[in-house]
Interface confidence: low
């Protein structure tokens, strides 16, 4: 049985570490998926790298790496979103 | 480096009892979230059981009553207790902190 999306976002967005991540059981990170979005925009300065993830996920995703070495899942429709991974893109 | 290194796993009948461990290393486990999660033969990841820095507890429905999530800070160690045991809890189980999962012990759960 697959796990419902709900209670993914519990996995990971727990009371004591709720940065909205729900993403990525596995090491490697290309395997990563999302099961929830960020609610708010990350400050741009925040963000080190993204990646996407795999066309497998149920769900579409970018998941941010942030300086401090956080991962949080967003949105890839939200236009904050496609704004970040242009410019990192043309920073590369 | 985080390591996460699963112990327990095994073959019993069901309605039996297993009790999973989880070494953990290489970040502050008693401030972080930790979970466990499985994967059944052909199947995707399950969530089982979340317990949060304060001890607050999430349990999937499916092993909701039957399972106990708890762990210990001073040893850094995460466990499963799991009883009424039943053939469909075979799986691979995992033990995860963020975005890393340990290499899984295997639950059998068979006559």
């Known amino acids: 049985m697959q796990v419902s999306t709900a209670a993914l976002a519990v996995l990971l967005c727990t009371m004591a570490l709720c940065n909205q991540f729900s993403a990525s059981l596995a090491a490697d990170t290309p395997t990563a998926c999302c099961f929830s979005y960020t609610s708010r925009q990350i400050p741009q300065n925040f963000i080190a790298d993204y990646f996407e993830t795999s066309s497998q996920c149920s769900k579409p995703g970018v998941i941010f790496l942030t300086k401090r070495s956080r991962q949080v899942c967003a949105d890839p429709s939200e236009e904050w979103v496609q704004k970040y991974v242009s410019d990192l893109e043309l920073s590369a | 480096e985080v390591q996460l290194v699963e112990s327990g796993g095994g073959l019993v009948q069901p309605g039996g009892s297993l009790r999973l461990s989880c070494a953990a290393s290489?970040?502050?486990?008693?401030?972080?979230?930790m979970s466990w999660v499985r994967q059944a033969p052909g199947k995707g990841l399950e969530w089982i059981s979340t317990i949060n820095s304060g001890g607050w507890r999430s349990y999937a429905d499916s092993v909701k009553g039957r399972f106990t999530i708890s762990r210990d800070d001073g040893q850094n160690t995460l466990y499963l207790q799991m009883n009424s045991l039943k053939p469909e809890d075979t799986a691979v189980y995992y033990c995860v902190h963020q975005n890393y999962r340990g290499q899984g012990t295997q639950v059998t759960v068979s006559s």
């Open positions: 290489g970040f502050a486990f008693s401030t972080n979230a």
